[in-house]
């Protein structure tokens, strides 16, 4: 499979690895979003790992209110992160495709 | 790198493979965005190669109605096939993870 | 300490639409909560009307959800409410909150209320 | 939309009495179970969220139990000013529900 078409399925694969831990096997509750969140994005989060902290990121995501987040949730949340990314990576022209 | 960070990395990079070859080097126009599709994301194309259906892509994608797709727009057709991919896995229990 | 206050007409004449306005105060009007209202039917009994929340995300009743419109203006650390078409079931006192980010989504600081009658 | 059946609907007792109020969901909220206390003319005061955890400035004598379906909340020695209406809320889902009411008045 071509790169993008593997980062997709490692994005669906991430999420119901941990999703799948308890619960509602097709929702990530806080624990298993904080299980995810440390082992799989610790770039992410960085040294941000107190509890108030994981409060406020789940009640962002969680945009149906259910104290969970489902896949489309999780989806949202990962674009965001590609974009804080894509914007890191314009601002650098070195780290940049050639100029049009 | 974990494989999830690895992943939207992949997201950002191969977004500017694209839409650096011609006109806004942050926007991806119909041009760079059928290359992207033939190249990148051949499973989701399938046979579907016609005109049409290429300017109706582009169409449903270009939410801001500029003729180009920027990364959020990308962001989002990216999550969109996620969810479809997401759907498929969670239509087959023998894929899934250990039930909860 | 966070304040919440409500403004609005007390009166409102059946068929015509309800608004009200609710300034936060002692807060930053944050994306880190949802901002509620929430009714007092005459009776005690306690309606959830609807919030907004993070990006604008608004959730409704949908027992109102028809009728019910709501806003915010972030500049002016507002958010409001318009009910539509209201008829002598929508006299209530009328409260606004915050939703806290904790488990359950708590409503931990609330209005003072505004008793809205609808009557010809 | 989930049923909250709060009960009694009112009761009477003395100040130092230990009182239980108890509150039943139509289906499972998973602890996600807050407590409001209201007087006269005011408006609602958050006691206990996620079914046990005391919200700030609340006095220790006021605490919650429970899971699935039902719950409870226990003043344990109950003062002057606790005379007033709780409400339970289930915050599991949309849309958010409350319970009728406890009317806690002195016998």
């Known amino acids: 499979a071509c790169p993008l078409e593997k980062a997709l399925d490692v994005m669906v694969s991430t999420f119901h690895k941990y999703s799948g831990k308890e619960g509602d096997k097709f929702k990530l509750n806080k624990s298993e979003l904080k299980e995810l969140l440390t082992r799989e994005l610790p770039s992410f989060l960085g040294k941000r790992t107190d509890e108030a902290a994981f409060q406020k990121l789940m009640s962002n995501l969680d945009s149906n209110r259910d104290n969970e987040v489902d896949f489309q949730e999780y989806c949202v949340f990962l674009s965001c992160i590609a974009m804080m990314c894509n914007e890191f990576f314009e601002g650098f022209p070195d780290k940049q495709p050639r100029k049009k | 790198a974990c494989p999830l960070e690895k992943a939207l990395d992949v997201m950002v990079s191969t977004f500017h493979k694209y839409s650096g070859k011609e006109g806004d080097k942050f926007k991806l126009n119909k041009s760079e965005l059928k290359e992207l599709l033939t190249r990148e994301l051949p499973s989701f194309l399938g046979k579907r190669t016609d005109e049409a259906a290429f300017q109706k892509l582009m169409s449903n994608l270009d939410s801001n109605r500029d003729n180009e797709v920027d990364f959020q727009e990308y962001c989002v057709f990216l999550s969109c096939i996620a969810m479809m991919c997401n759907e498929f896995f969670e239509g087959f229990p023998d894929k899934q993870p250990r039930k909860k | 300490q966070v304040q919440l206050q409500e403004s609005g007409p007390g009166l409102v004449k059946p068929s015509q639409t309800l608004s009200l306005t609710c300034t936060v105060s002692g807060d930053s009007f944050t994306n880190d909560y949802y901002w509620n209202w929430i009714r007092q039917h005459p009776g005690s009994k306690l309606e959830w009307i609807g919030h907004i929340g993070y990006g604008g995300n608004i959730n409704y009743n949908p027992s109102l959800k028809n009728r019910l419109s709501m806003s915010r203006d972030t500049s002016k650390n507002q958010f409001s409410l318009k009910l539509s078409s209201v008829t002598a079931a929508d006299t209530a006192v009328y409260y606004c909150?915050?939703?806290?980010?904790?488990?359950?989504?708590?409503?931990?600081?609330w209005g003072q209320g505004t008793l809205v009658t609808v009557s010809s | 939309d989930i049923q909250m059946t709060q009960s009694p609907s009112s009761l009477s007792a003395s100040v130092g009495d230990r009182v239980t109020i108890t509150c039943r969901a139509s289906q499972d909220i998973r602890n996600y179970l807050n407590w409001y206390q209201q007087k006269p003319g005011k408006a609602l005061k958050l006691l206990l969220y996620?079914?046990?955890r005391l919200h700030s400035g609340v006095p220790s004598r006021f605490s919650g139990s429970g899971s699935g379906t039902d719950y409870t909340l226990t003043i344990s020695s109950l003062q002057p000013e606790d005379f007033a209406t709780y409400y339970c809320?289930?915050?599991?889902?949309?849309?958010?529900?409350f319970g009728g009411g406890t009317k806690v008045e002195i016998k």
């Open positions: 996620y079914t046990s």
């Open positions: 909150t915050r939703e806290s980010f904790y488990d359950g989504y708590p409503f931990d600081y």
């Open positions: 809320q289930q915050g599991n889902s949309l849309p958010r529900t």
